[in-house]
Amino acid sequence: MSVTACQGLGFVVSLIGFAGIIAATCMDQWSTQDLYNNPVTAVFNYQGLWRSCVRESSGFTECRGYFTLLGLPAMLQAVRALMIVGIVLGVIGILVSIFALKCIRIGSMDDSAKAKMTLTSGILFIISGICAIIGVSVFANMLVTNFWMSTANMYSGMGGMGGMVQTVQTRYTFGAALFVGWVAGGLTLIGGVMMCIACRGLTPDDSNFKAVSYHASGQNVAYRPGGFKASTGFGSNTRNKKIYDGGARTEDDEQSHPTKYDYV
């Protein structure tokens, strides 16, 4: 796959993942009422990160926001924080990656700058995806713990009126938002990895070495460390070339950076 295609695909995949992270964060169905014991419920409860909702058979749906911060479980606060961090990093990653795209020309930005930006955006996407996956997983773990605690309470003696009156304990299970979040986080992560791979293709691998000029007797040719390849412009062409610091590009070099095979 070409560098441009890899970078472009990574960007698109990350963008889809990022949109999914936003969608998951906003969704109300992070946890939904477990209908195993009562599949024909007339009142259906579901909860999100920001509000809890009740949908009745009548069609009436009521949602109430969590207007308190202090009264909320620390785990829920942590999940909220992780999702927001994921979104913020994703926004920055998108902005950086737009400028890093090889297919977009912005002023005199050279490939090494684009490579650095591609790597930066890739890392941001990876962290964004990880934040989302961790956030969703923490919430899922919280649900599993509460589910089994509710189940234990449900079967440990029904109190009141000598066991005659049953108290229906509402248990919650995984909501659609969790699956959206996992998939979205995974896509953002994959997109970020692809951006990092694309960065390797954009980076001149010999740019870390200083070019050294050797003055051969009888010839005034500057040599770069490396084999003689037609693609390097050496061998048949013996015109004087001024080597810049870092040896990334020659004065009249029209092509992009040497490939990673340009050194021995």
Partner: antibody, heavy 118, light 113 residues
Framework: DVKLVESGGGLVKPGGSLKLSCAAS????????MSWVRQTPEKRLEWVAT????????YYPDSVKGRFTISRDNAKNTLYLQMSSLKSEDTAMYYC???????????WGQGTSVAVSS | DIVMTQSPSSLTVTTGEKVTMSCKSS????????????LSWYQQIPGQPPKLLFY???TRESGVPDRFTGSGSGTDFTLTISNVQAEDLAVYYC?????????FGAGTKLELR
Amino acid sequence: DVKLVESGGGLVKPGGSLKLSCAASGFTFSSYTMSWVRQTPEKRLEWVATIIIGGSYTYYPDSVKGRFTISRDNAKNTLYLQMSSLKSEDTAMYYCTRLVKGNAMDYWGQGTSVAVSS
Amino acid sequence: DIVMTQSPSSLTVTTGEKVTMSCKSSQSLLNSGNQKNYLSWYQQIPGQPPKLLFYWASTRESGVPDRFTGSGSGTDFTLTISNVQAEDLAVYYCQNDYSYPFTFGAGTKLELR
């Protein structure tokens, strides 16, 4: 003004069938969950069936499940109750009702009488 | 199924009196999601269909006089008529709106002494 008018009741033999209709007016019929409730000669109220707004979900008590079918025609603003394999215990006044907040029934029709007797 | 038990089955009152009738459910009708009790009260005047008085146990339906009060939570509910009028003589039913099958109480008949 909300109006629910039931029709289709009558005398039927055990094992027979009957189809009740409920013509709704004065409200957006398609936006409401509808139910049928019956009142026995002993004046006991029994819920018979519920059909959710879109018509995709229907609910019945065990006493009528498999014998009664609730349906709706939103274009005609009409609710139906198809009753088959009728038993003497199905003898009652059948009311068409509209569900609102709290799953409560805010409007009831005047009812249609069904008598199952040999 | 949730069983609704109403008591007393009949009440004999004089106009102006305060009346209280009870409704008990075999399961809690309190929904943890919105902290609302899914119980409704109906009034049936002879020869007429039932009329909704309260939903969510205590939310008064529009047009219902404020002498009627619905209260209670969980499994125990009460309908109170503070100043009984002649037009209040009817049968009062409570209903479980929380889970299918929806079930009604046997009713409390309010009669004039």
